[in-house]
């Protein structure tokens, strides 16, 4: 990669966490949602 | 998280294998640094392994460590021939031209 | 080969004062911003403060201001606390992906 060793950045791992977490409050969410509804 | 271990007392000359194990994230897409620090002394850059298994080292650390993956959740460190001068704590540390997930470190010991 | 020098060795200063803290790289560093800020205490591994010159890692109090490009970086500790006692290390990425250290301050907080 032309990036080399700097592909790793911070800046990207603090989107990727925003992502992970966005992703678990969803989900987490629709679960709830599927729970109340049974 | 990242861990460091096999830090022990060895003989000069003895080579030695550090283990640095993560958890929570892939080295598929993870730069790991090795990074040492002699009692009282500073921080001291090894070398780096990228998401693509490429090694990096420090001028002086070539020919004297060799970094390896070892697994997806492993990365080693080999000190080939230790000298007394390698005695210090070695850090395990995520990032590429950035450190910023930090293992406690293991203590290795040269001594006769 | 690449070599941070980083002054002074040693600042003291009292609770609420500001302390700065020099970096100086003998090549420019990736991008003209890979240098990165650490805090270390004894018995610890450092604690990632500033990434890319001036950006504040997650969770760093805004009293830590980092600043420069290329190869003159510096940190700055305002609203000193007796917390901040530590030393401080920077860190520089290369685009031929060598990275380093310099040698550290020692923060005194009287």
């Known amino acids: 990669h032309s990036d080399g060793i700097f592909t790793d950045s911070y800046s990207r791992y603090r989107k990727q966490m925003a992502v992970k977490k966005y992703l678990a409050a969803v989900l987490g969410k629709r679960y709830k949602q599927r729970v109340k509804n049974k | 998280s990242v861990e460091e271990s096999g830090g022990r007392l060895v003989t000069p000359g003895t080579p030695l294998t550090l283990t640095c194990t993560v958890s929570?994230?892939?080295?598929?897409?993870?730069?790991m640094n090795w990074v040492r620090q002699a009692p009282g002394k500073g921080l001291e850059w090894i070398g780096i392994?990228?998401?693509?298994?490429?090694t990096y080292y420090a001028p002086w650390a070539k020919g004297r460590f060799t970094i390896s993956k070892t697994s997806s959740t492993t990365v080693d460190l080999k000190m080939t021939s230790p000298t007394t001068e390698d005695t210090a704590t070695y850090f395990c540390?995520?990032?590429?031209?950035?450190?910023?997930?930090w293992g406690p470190g293991t203590l290795v010991t040269v001594s006769s | 080969a690449q070599v941070l020098t980083q002054t002074p060795s040693s600042v003291s200063a009292a609770v609420g004062g500001t302390v700065t803290i020099n970096c100086q790289s003998s090549?420019?560093?990736?991008?003209?911003?890979?240098l990165s800020w650490y805090q270390q205490k004894p018995g610890q591994p450092p604690n990632f403060l500033i990434y890319?010159?001036?950006n504040l890692a997650s969770g760093v109090p805004s009293r830590f201001k980092g600043s420069g490009s290329g190869t003159q970086f510096t940190l700055t500790i305002s609203d000193l606390e007796c917390d901040d006692a530590a030393t401080y290390y920077c860190?520089?990425?290369?685009?031929?992906?060598?990275?380093?250290f310099g040698g550290g301050t020692e923060v005194v907080v009287k």
């Open positions: 890319q010159a001036s």
């Open positions: 392994i990228d998401n693509t298994a490429g």
């Open positions: 929570g994230f892939s080295l598929s897409s993870a730069a």
């Open positions: 090549q420019s560093v990736h991008d003209g911003s890979y």
């Open positions: 860190a520089g990425g290369y685009s031929s992906n060598i990275c380093g």
């Open positions: 540390a995520r990032g590429g031209g950035e450190f910023f997930i």
